[in-house]
Each structure stands twice: as C-alpha cells, then as structure tokens.
Interface confidence: medium
C-alpha cells in the first residue's frame, strides 16, 4: 500500500487577503441602445458590441486612453464624441474631481479650443446629441457642442457655502448617494439641478497632517443631529435658450415647506414633466410631487392633486432611502415600493392617489428594487424565493395581463451557485445582463429580454475558480435561530475540518445598522474567511432587529432607541451559539466597523461576561456626533421635548465602567470625514476617566475606510495579532 498523500490543499493566508489574490470580477454592459453596449477590455480598449449582428470592434483604443492617462470614459448619445476622465481625485464617498478631455471619434483627435477647466466636479452628456453639462467650482456650465464656448448657468457657487448641481457632504452621504445633483430631461431640452445653501451649517474641522511643517485643517459644513441643515432649492433651466429665461425654481409642496425639509430625489417623467420627492425633517412623511412645464407662464407648476403623500406610523418613511417611482408609458401612473398594510415593502401601482394604489406584490417578504418598467413587463428584485431574506432573485411581472402574471427569471438558473442577483437592462429591456454574486463564484450572463434565454456568459471567474482549487475554504451556513417570538438569520463560517464535537473560538462580526443586511447569500474571500480557514475560528454574522427586508415590525423595532435591540439580539445569538455545543465559552470576541463598531462597543460593555475581547473600528459613540439626516431619521431630535434622553443614554461613553473586564481595541482614522475621530476620542477620554485599560490605534490622515494599501495591511495585521492573543492562538 502506498502512503496517502494527504490533503494537498492549503489554508488561506492573511497575505492572500491583503493582496486581493482571490478577488472576483463582474461584467456590467455599458448599454448604448436596445442591442448595443460598450465594455472596457482587460487591456483597456473600449469595445463596441452588437448582440444581434454579433459584431464587435474597438471604438476607442487603449493608446488613446493612455495618451491622457484616462481611467474612465463616456460616449455621447450621438456617438460622435467620448469624454476621457483622468487625474481622478477622491473627495467623499461618491464625489471626486477629475480632468476631462473630449475625443472626436469622427476626426480621430482630441477637441481643441474651449477646453474644459480643471478640476471638474461633475460632467455628463445630455441624453440626446452631444450637449455637455458640468460643474466647476460649485457652478454649472453648459456647452451646446464640445467645441463651443461654455455658457455659465449659475453664479452663486461658493466653496463650502453654495453648491450647484452637486450635493454638499450630508446630502451626498445620507440622501442622494451620488456625486451629482443635476438631471437632464429625456430629450435634453431641460436641465434640473439643486442648489444647496450651507451658509449657516456648523463646520467640522480636523487636522490633515500630510508632510508639511504645519498640518492643514479640513473644514466641512457638516450638520450633526439637531443642527441647522442645508437649505435646498430646485431649479430647471431650458438649455436650448439658457440666456433668454434664467433657471426657473420648482415650488415646494405646502405641507413640506411649513417646517424644515429635505429634497430627496428627482425623476424626469417626460420631456416636460418632472417628479420631485421631498421629505420632512422628521422623516416619517414624504411627498412625491409631479410638476409640468407651463409654456404660457414659463414656469413649472406642481398642482396639489399631483402630490402623493407617503407616511409611516411605526417608524421612518421608506427603507434606508425613500423609494423612487418607476413611471409607466402613460407618464402619469407609476410603480413604487412602499410598506403595505402588513408592514412589508411591496410594489404598488399608483394611478391617481396613494389611497387607491393597487398592490402588485404581496406576502411576508419584500420587494427590493424595480429595475425597469416597459410596455408589457415590470422587472424587480425580491427576497421571496424559499423564504430566505438574504437572497435576491429577479422577477418579471407581465403587466399587460389581467391579473398580472409573475415569473421568477433567476430562481432556477444556477440554483446552488446563484441566489443573489442584480441586473442591468438595455433601454427597453430587449436584452439584459444578470450579475450573480453568490453564494458560489460570481457569474455574469447576457439574456434575451423577451424569452429570458441565456445568450452568453460574459464573465464566469474561471481563473479564480482555478486558483481556489488548492485552497481550503471554510464551510458557510445560512440558518435561522429563534428566541421568544423572534427569528434571527445568521451566517456561520466554519473552519475547513470543522468537528462538531470539538470546541472553537467564536468571532461575531457585526454591523447591525437600521435597514442594513449582513446575512446575504454572496461569495466572499476576506479577512474573516482567512480567520476561519487558517486560524480555526468560527465566525458568525447575525441580522438582529432593525435590519432590513423582513418587514417593518422587525425594522422599526429600533426606532427612537438605537443601541438597545441591536446589541440585545447579538447577545441572544451568542447564547444560542454556545448552546450548540462547539463554541469555547472562554474565547468569544466581537468586532465591527462604523455602526458595527458602535454595536460591538456596546456589546462588550453589556456586562454579560460573554465576550473576552473585541474590536471597534471607526465607531459612532454618540448619535449627537453623527449626521443630522441619519441620526434623526432613526432617533428623532436631540431635544428635551423629543428624544434627548435616549441620545444621552445610548452613548458608548455612558458605559465606560463596563469595559473593565474585557480586552478592547479601539481604532480610528484621524481624517474620517464621516464618523469623526471625535467619536473615538470621547470613548478614550471616558475610559481614561474611568481608569479602564484598553488598546487603541489611530491611522493618521486615513478616512472612514482606512483604505490606503499600507494602512489596510497594518490594520488587518494588527487586528489579527490582537485576536490571536485574545484566543491564545500561536503566531
């Protein structure tokens, strides 16, 4: 008998994770028509594809891209020009500045004369032709053609004071989730934009150390809970004759304008009809207002009977954001996701009033996103299939039929490999791409929009599959546990040679923020995968109360009392995991980032003795220190007659004494524009005042993501050492 060669597979290493060795690819077509799309190839050529004729050719060569060090591009709708983007300089989460060059595809050369200024804050083509709108130094400019002189639309722009066509910090992060705040009408005639006035907003100032003798000070108008908010106005300008009539302001609905309010989104319905969404500062009332252009008045009119109110009686309006409408071909009726009578978010069809809305989907699951509405179909995603909240499948509802018939497009395509999808549709959904994120290896495919037939595999991550063949990956389970009347879904990552009769250290990874979801059927090879694979640690992620897609009763449980149930439910889960018999009760840790850092800190300070140690990265420590739009959405106002008491009770600092019997590692970037270093500074101060020992690490000049290569390597190495020490694992 020959001796067996044993298991030749190796465990993951921390280096694998830090080098991104096992990262996956997705393929999103850049649609330019019903059947044509562009895609940037591996070697940076921009390639044109026609699905029907099967032709493909390079529309823009990598040498042209390289000549200006371009990293991105945008084709004009008339296909005559391409903008090339270079000198990318990140600002906040979505915003960045860049240099733009216009390349003339007909002549094969860059457009000279009236070159664009630099750096530009935002630039986009009109939906038709090749008009350009761009934002430079907080003002909006228009070019009728790339070679034409620019026309200045706004003059009020001023750094940190007035923003035109781009959001200020809080709107970018907490309301729009975009770098832009301007929208072309479908025919390119009108340009709508928002003006944000931050003149009265308090400034957050922090040091940026750089390399100089003196640090720079970064100043950001940043409204914290209860502070003065930006003042918003929406304007629409006729881009055909911008000099004849200036920008026209769109009126705010009366019921909104009566107190502090937010603009939440803008959707063009047709060439002369626009839909604006507004939200009261107390974010349980949202108003959708449909406005029409009145040629005779040269104004935009928003009749009261075209105002639709959405209100929550149990929490805040919408999910994380209020959903946006998907209009029908008639440009009057629309489809929208909001809570039904049973508190589950579902698609409704609104023809005249919200009261008369027709519910399109129903059940104790949630519709998540409407991708596309065509003449006869509506495509949406939901977590309906087989009752797993952490899955996403794409459905088609045939809206021509009565009653509408529903088909799951993705449920049975690659059932084991793919349970979490998104989609990208061509203009009228003649074709679409499906991007599957897991639980198996991600795969992107192209489909016929009529028959749903798969036409082509766009990316199947073959190389990744091959390189993972000799890796011992942990086993991932998604299950649920019960406590009282509550159900908590959890994901458990088990070491490769997991043996139920043995005892393992447990690490809880938590986020837990309102309307978030951690337990998702997606593929990932990351730090926690390594900890399970190499270090033999069991990892668990639990979606407690306040998390999304399981109905409003579960979601709104945390309303006005953040920091209570999110923590309680993590503790409940840990107790249940201990009952399973394979967890070493003496070696349990918890870690989280951002909201997760807040929850992990409170869990460590719960006084339960469940945790030996834990890590908080960039934690919020008091909701008074965080952004108004976010904090107030879930907590109300920090005033005596509102919710100040819970703002005070829910701080990490209030529990400083309780950190005495745990090992705590506190980490923060000093240039965190989002969750300010102030949060960790206050935790540290409270711990010092209570004479509680703890460990800490700061990352100079790093923001909320601590994402620079060197910092990230240091961070994960440091956290690994801390954990291994806590769990008595040899290095």
């Amino acid at each position: 008998l020959r001796p067996s060669r044993g298991n030749t597979k190796r465990a993951l290493t921390l280096k694998d994770i830090l080098n991104g060795t096992f990262s996956y690819k997705t393929y999103f077509p850049n649609w330019i028509s019903e059947q044509e799309y562009l895609h940037q190839s591996e070697d940076d050529n921009i390639v044109f594809y026609n699905i029907e004729t099967r032709e493909s050719y390079i529309i823009l060569s990598n040498s042209t891209m390289k000549s200006v060090n371009a990293t991105d591009y945008g084709l004009s709708p008339d296909r005559q020009f391409v903008y090339l983007e270079s000198d990318y300089s990140k600002l906040w989460r979505y915003s960045y500045t860049a240099t733009y060059y216009i390349y003339d595809l007909q002549n094969g050369e860059f457009v000279r004369g009236y070159e664009l200024p630099r750096p530009i804050q935002y630039l986009c083509w009109s939906p038709v032709g090749s008009k350009l709108a761009y934002v430079y130094q907080n003002n909006i400019y228009l070019k009728q053609r790339p070679g034409d002189p620019p026309f200045q639309i706004t003059y009020t722009g001023r750094e940190n004071r007035i923003f035109n066509g781009i959001p200020d910090w809080v709107y970018e992060e907490e309301m729009l989730a975009t770098k832009y705040a301007l929208w072309w009408s479908p025919d390119g005639k009108f340009l709508a934009y928002v003006e944000f006035n931050d003149s009265d907003i308090p400034i957050i100032a922090y040091s940026y150390y750089g390399d100089g003798q003196y640090p720079r000070t970064i100043n950001i108008p940043y409204p914290k809970a209860g502070a003065k908010n930006p003042v918003v106005r929406v304007f629409i300008v006729d881009t055909t004759y911008p000099h004849h009539v200036g920008p026209m302001e769109v009126p705010v609905p009366e019921m909104i304008a009566s107190s502090d309010y937010y603009f939440s989104w803008l959707t063009w319905v047709s060439s002369e009809r626009v839909c604006l969404q507004w939200l009261k500062r107390v974010q349980n009332v949202s108003v959708l207002s449909i406005c029409d252009f009145r040629e005779d008045w040269h104004a935009w009119e928003c009749p009261k009977n075209q105002e639709h109110v959405e209100e929550s009686r149990t929490g805040w309006a919408g999910g994380f954001f209020v959903s946006t409408p998907a209009f029908s071909q008639d440009a009057t009726s629309y489809y929208k996701i909001f809570s039904d009578k049973d508190g589950y978010k579902h698609i409704h069809y609104i023809k005249d009033t919200v009261e008369n809305a027709i519910q399109i989907t129903s059940g104790k699951w949630e519709a998540i996103y409407i991708f596309r509405v065509t003449q006869d179909s509506l495509f949406y995603s939901s977590n309906e299939f087989e009752g797993y909240p952490g899955r996403r499948n794409i459905y088609r509802i045939s809206i021509g039929n009565s009653p509408p018939s529903k088909k799951c497009v993705t449920c049975h395509l690659r059932k084991e490999r793919c349970q979490y999808y998104t989609a990208s549709f061509s203009y009228k959904a003649k074709y679409y791409a499906l991007v599957c994120y897991g639980p198996g290896l991600p795969i992107s495919t192209l489909h016929d929009g009529r028959t749903d037939q798969e036409i082509q595999v766009l990316e199947e991550n073959k190389e990744l599959e091959n390189s993972l063949r000799n890796i011992q990956l942990p086993k991932v389970e998604i299950k649920k546990l019960k406590d009282g009347g509550l159900t908590f879904w959890y994901k458990m990552i088990l070491p490769p040679q997991f043996d139920r009769s043995k005892k393992y250290p447990l690490l809880i990874q938590v986020y837990g923020g309102p309307c978030s979801q951690s337990v998702k059927s997606v593929f990932a090879v990351n730090w926690i995968t390594y900890l399970a694979s190499k270090e033999g640690i069991v990892i668990a992620l639990v979606d407690g109360r306040g998390t999304a897609f399981q109905g409003d009763k579960f979601l709104h449980a945390v309303y006005r009392k953040l920091g209570v149930y999110e923590v309680e439910d993590q503790l409940t889960a840990v107790r249940k995991f201990i009952e399973m018999g394979f967890i070493d009760e003496e070696r349990i840790a918890i870690w989280g980032w951002s909201y997760g850092g807040y929850v992990s800190s409170l869990a460590l300070a719960s006084g339960t003795g469940l945790f030996k140690c834990g890590i908080a990265v960039a934690p919020v420590s008091s909701w008074e220190y965080y952004a108004s739009i976010y904090s107030e959405r879930f907590m109300g106002l920090p005033t005596k007659d509102d919710n100040l008491e819970h703002y005070k009770n829910s701080t990490v600092m209030a529990r400083a004494e309780y950190f005495r019997n745990v090992d705590y590692l506190l980490i923060h970037g000093t240039a965190d524009d989002n969750v300010h270093f102030q949060n960790s500074a206050q935790i540290a101060k409270a711990l010092v005042n209570a004479q509680v020992d703890f460990q800490a690490m700061w990352y100079s000049d790093q923001n909320h993501g601590i994402s620079s290569g060197r910092s990230q390597n240091h961070l994960y190495t440091h956290m690994t050492h801390f954990l291994k020490q806590c769990f008595s694992l040899s290095d």
Epitope: D340, K341, D342, W365, E386, T487
Partner: antibody
C-alpha cells in the same frame, strides 16, 4: 392563556346564510393575522379564509370565494365569517385559528363550531 | 395551488417504536412547512413550524426535517398519547391559498 371560542354554527338549508363568530382572548388580537379552517366529517383540514392584522387584506379558498366574507372587530376582539349561499359541501366543523406573527401557520385553534347544510 | 401529499395514509406501530411520516410538496416551499397533531374530537395542535422548529411545550421526541419539496416528521419513541392523525401545512410566502396535506393516521398495531 390564549383562548379562541367559536359560535354561530347550526343547521341551515342550501342557499341560506350563517354568521360565525370567534371570541379571542389572552393575546393582543389586533396584532395577529387570523384565519378559518374547516374539517368535513371524517375528512382532512381545509383552509377557508384569512385576514391580515389591519383587516385590509382578506383571502379566500376558491371553493368559498364570492360567498364567504371574513372580517374582524378589534374593539371587541372578535373574528367573523359571514357565509352566504351555503351548499351541502360546506358542511364541516369550522375552526377559528390564530396565525403566528410572522408566518401563516396556526399557533392556536378554537374547538370549532359545526355547520350543517342540509335540505 | 401547491399540493401536499402525505404518506403513508395509515401507519400501524406499537408504543416505543419510531414513526416516520412523509410530506411531499408539488413545488418548493422552502422551509415554510408546519406539522399538526389532531386527536379525535379535538382541535389540531401545532407541533413543528418552519420545517424543523418545535412549537412551545412539544416534547423533543417530535422532530421535523427537510426543505424544498421533501419533509419528514419523526416521532423517535411512540407514547400512547401520540396515536392520532398528523397533518402537514405549507405557508410558502404566507401567500394564500394555504394548503394542508391529506393527513397520516398513526394507529396502534
């Protein structure tokens, strides 16, 4: 303790009507979906109708659609089933049942009330 | 409509024996399946929900398993009070019509 007590059953002729009531106690009636399930003599269980918390959404088995109406009155913790145009095949023991707060299985059942439709 | 088929129709066993009841769904119902016990002259009683979770105060000799289309109710050691009719019920997506299986009668051999 959760209690569900059905009443209103009896003997009627085909085509006649009957209204069943279910008095609920021991739980917050307004927070739970409710349902009616019936069992013909010597047969299995058949779901008849359901009503959501709000009372705004009501559901029926095809066999009773258009003839039966479910309703609820949260002020007196009562569930109703209005049965019109009764047929011989509606003869059964009718149970009132409380659904789980998140899923449509039945956590608690009443003892039932007998409806006999006979000429 | 989702059809549930229970087998066998009748199971004749002695006290102390193991009972295995099957319920098959005409299409996947995920884990949305419950089991009930009904004794003569009594209302049904919830035993198992979500395919495998025991209801309050149900002895641990009752266990449920399965997902998708195949489900099993197991009674590890039959007690005299376990002889009854057992029904499965699907509540897939909690979306009507809710359906019950035809029942399995567990009788004393």
């Amino acid at each position: 303790d959760v209690q569900l007590v059905e009443s209103g059953g009896g003997v009627v002729r085909p085509g006649e009507s009957l209204r069943l009531s279910c008095a609920a106690s021991g739980f917050t009636f307004s927070s739970y979906d409710m349902g009616w399930v019936r069992q013909a003599p010597g047969e299995g269980l058949e779901w008849v109708s359901g009503i959501r918390v709000s009372g705004g959404s009501t559901y029926y088995a095809d066999s009773v659609k258009g003839r039966f109406t479910i309703s609820r009155d949260s002020s007196n913790n009562t569930l109703y089933l209005q049965m019109n145009s009764l047929r011989a095949e509606d003869t059964a023991l009718y149970y009132c049942a409380k659904e789980n707060d998140r899923h449509s299985f039945f956590e608690y059942w009443g003892l039932g009330t007998l409806v006999t439709v006979s000429s | 409509e989702i059809v549930l088929t229970q087998s066998p129709g009748t199971l004749s066993l002695s006290p102390g024996e193991r009972a295995t009841l099957s319920c098959r769904a005409s299409q996947s119902v995920g884990y949305y399946l419950a089991w009930y016990q009904q004794k003569p002259g009594q209302a049904p009683r919830l035993l198992i929900y979500d395919a495998s979770d025991r209801a309050t105060a149900i002895p641990d000799r009752f266990s449920g398993s399965g997902s998708g289309t195949e489900f099993t109710l197991t009674i590890s050691r039959l007690e005299p009070e376990d002889f009854a009719v057992y029904y499965c019920q699907q509540y897939y997506n909690n979306w009507p019509p809710l359906t019950f299986g035809g029942g399995t009668k567990v009788e004393i051999k």
